[in-house]
C-alpha cells in the first residue's frame, strides 16, 4: 500500500513540476524591468525565452518574438535548450510512469517490468528537474550579471551619454515557476525511485539446503527473504521457517524474474 | 463619436474645494484611459492626473496631494477633486482621451475655467 | 520630473515655407523594448483645446495633413509643417509620453511672415 502511495504521490508531484517547467517555459516574465531608483514609467518592459514584451500603463500589451536564432546569446540557447530537454525528458517520464504505476493494471505485466519503468521514469524526472533548475539559474546568473554591468554603465554616464538611462533587468516570475517547478519535478523523481525499491526488492535465490536436526526439524534457506524497503507488504515473502521437515524440492521457492540461480 | 463634456468649473475661494466632472460618450471609461490636463491664462499645457481603464491613477507629483482623479464607470463620468486651492489653480481644466497605443491624448474636451480669487 | 524645451518660443514663416519646431528631453524618451518613442506633438489654435498631430514621434495621427511631419529619437526630436498654410497658426507643444508626470514643452508659437 505505502509503495503504491508513494509511487502515486511521486507521478503526481512530478506531473506538477513539469506542468510547471513547460509554464515557466512558455512565460514572457523570465525578466522584468527594474523600476528600482528610477523614474515613474508608463512603459514597462519585459522579456521570455521567446519574446520581449512591452505593457503600457494603458493596458496595451505588444509582445514580438525573437525571429532571429543565430542574432541571440548563447547562454539564452543554452537556457531554451535545458528548458526543452526538461520538458521532454519529464514528459517521456509521465508517458513511462503512467504505465509503470501499481494501481493500473496492462495486461500481465509484472512488477518486476512496473518496477523498472518506474526507476526510469524516476531517473528521468530527476535529469528533467536538474535541467529546469539548471536552465533557471543560468538565466538568472546572465540577469545578475548584466544587472551589475549596465549598474556600473549608469554611473559612469555611458561614455558622457548621461541623458540615456539603461534599462535594468531583473528576476521574474517565471524563474521562481522554474525553480519550483524543477525542484517538484526532482522530489517527484526522487520518489518514484524509493517507490521502485518497494516494487522491485532485490533477491538472491540459492538451492535450499535442509539441516535435520533431532525434535523439530528446520529447513534453512540462505537469502530466503527478499531484502523488502518496509513499504507495503510482499506477497511473495514466504516464511522459511517451518515445524515440519522438508525435501529441497519442496522448499525451493516459485519462480521469479529475480531467480538468478 | 467620441465627445467628452466637462462642467463644474467656476469662481472659487483660495482654501475652498472644488470638484470637476468629465462626462463622456463614445467609448466607455473600462477601456480607455483618460487625462486631466490644465492650461493658466496665457500659459502653456501642465498635465494634472489620469486615471487608467483599469482604475489604476498617476498624478502630477507638482501638486502635493491635493488633487483626487475618480470615475464612475457606470455613469461614464471622471471626476477632479481639487481641495486647498490656490490663486496658480487658476486655469482652463480640460480632460482628454488617452488614444491607447504610445500614450497620446487623442480627444480632447472644450475645457471648464477655475478661477480661485478672493 | 523630465524636461521638455522647445525652441524656438516664436516663429514666423512665410506662406508655403518650411517650419522646424525642436524639442529636447531631458531624459531619453526611447523605449529599448520596443524602439519607440514615447512624445507626442498637439497643436492648439486660439480658444480651442489641443488637437494630437503626432504621437510616438513620427506617427502621424488620422485626418492630420501629411505636411506635419515628426522625428527625432532618444531626447531630440522635430515636428516639421513643410508648407505652411494660413490654418497652421497656432501654438506648438511637444510631451514626455514615457515618464509620469508626461509634462508638455513650454510651447512654440507659429506665425506667418
Known amino acids: 500500500m505505502a509503495v503504491t502511495a508513494c509511487q502515486g504521490l511521486g507521478f503526481v508531484v512530478s506531473l506538477i513540476g513539469i506542468a510547471g517547467i513547460i509554464a515557466a517555459t512558455c512565460m514572457d516574465q523570465w525578466s522584468t524591468q527594474d523600476l528600482y531608483n528610477n523614474p515613474v514609467t508608463a512603459v514597462f518592459n519585459y522579456q521570455g525565452l521567446w519574446r520581449s514584451c512591452v505593457r503600457e500603463s494603458s493596458g496595451f500589451t505588444e509582445c514580438r518574438g525573437y525571429f532571429t536564432l543565430l542574432g541571440l546569446p548563447a547562454m539564452l540557447q543554452a537556457v531554451r535548450a535545458l528548458m526543452i530537454v526538461g520538458i521532454v525528458l519529464g514528459a517521456i517520464g509521465l508517458l513511462v510512469s503512467i504505465f509503470a504505476l501499481k494501481c493500473i493494471r496492462i495486461g500481465s505485466m509484472e512488477d518486476s517490468a512496473k518496477a523498472n519503468m518506474t526507476l526510469t521514469s524516476g531517473i528521468m524526472f530527476i535529469v528533467s528537474g536538474l535541467c529546469a533548475i539548471a536552465g533557471v539559474s543560468v538565466f538568472a546568473n546572465m540577469l545578475v550579471t548584466n544587472f551589475w554591468m549596465s549598474t556600473a554603465n549608469m554611473y559612469t554616464g555611458m561614455g558622457g551619454m548621461v541623458q540615456t538611462v539603461q534599462t535594468r533587468y531583473t528576476f521574474g516570475a517565471a524563474l521562481f515557476v522554474g525553480w519550483v517547478a524543477g525542484g517538484l519535478t526532482l522530489i517527484g523523481g526522487v520518489m518514484m525511485c524509493i517507490a521502485c525499491r518497494g516494487l522491485a526488492p532485490e533477491e538472491t535465490n540459492y538451492k535450499a539446503v535442509s539441516y535435520h536436526a533431532s525434535g523439530h526439524s528446520v529447513a534453512y534457506k540462505p537469502g530466503g527473504f527478499k531484502a523488502s524497503t518496509g513499504f507495503g507488504s510482499n506477497t511473495k515473502n514466504k516464511k522459511i521457517y517451518d515445524g515440519g521437515a522438508r525435501t529441497e524440492d519442496e522448499v525451493q521457492s516459485y519462480p521469479s524474474k529475480h531467480d538468478y540461480v | 463619436q467620441v465627445q467628452l463634456v466637462e462642467s463644474g468649473g467656476g469662481v472659487v475661494q483660495p482654501g475652498r474645494s472644488l470638484r470637476l466632472s468629465c462626462t463622456v460618450s463614445?467609448?466607455?471609461?473600462?477601456?480607455?484611459?483618460v487625462y486631466w490636463v490644465r492650461q493658466a491664462p496665457g500659459k502653456g499645457l501642465e498635465w494634472v492626473a489620469v486615471v487608467w481603464a483599469g482604475g489604476n491613477t498617476n498624478y502630477n507629483s507638482a501638486l502635493k496631494g491635493r488633487f483626487t482623479i475618480s470615475k464612475d464607470n457606470s455613469k461614464s463620468t471622471l471626476y477632479l477633486q481639487m481641495n486647498s486651492l490656490r490663486a496658480e489653480d487658476t486655469a482652463v481644466y480640460y480632460c482628454a482621451r488617452d488614444r491607447g497605443r504610445l500614450l497620446a491624448m487623442d480627444y480632447w474636451g472644450q475645457g471648464t475655467l477655475v478661477t480661485v480669487s478672493s | 520630473d523630465i524636461v521638455m524645451t522647445q525652441s524656438p518660443d516664436s516663429l514666423a514663416v512665410s506662406l508655403g515655407e518650411r517650419a522646424t519646431i525642436n524639442c529636447k528631453s531631458s531624459q531619453s524618451l526611447l523605449n529599448s523594448g520596443n524602439q519607440k518613442n514615447y512624445l507626442a506633438w498637439y497643436q492648439q489654435k486660439p480658444g480651442q483645446p489641443p488637437k494630437l498631430l503626432i504621437y510616438g514621434a513620427s506617427t502621424r495621427e488620422s485626418g492630420v495633413p501629411d505636411r506635419f511631419t515628426g522625428s527625432g529619437s532618444g531626447t531630440d526630436f522635430t515636428l516639421t509643417i513643410s508648407s505652411l498654410q494660413a490654418e497652421d497658426v497656432a501654438v506648438y507643444y511637444c510631451q514626455n509620453d514615457h515618464f509620469f508626470p508626461f509634462t508638455f514643452g513650454q510651447g512654440t508659437k507659429v506665425e506667418i511672415k
Open positions: 463614445g467609448f466607455t471609461l473600462t477601456s480607455y484611459g
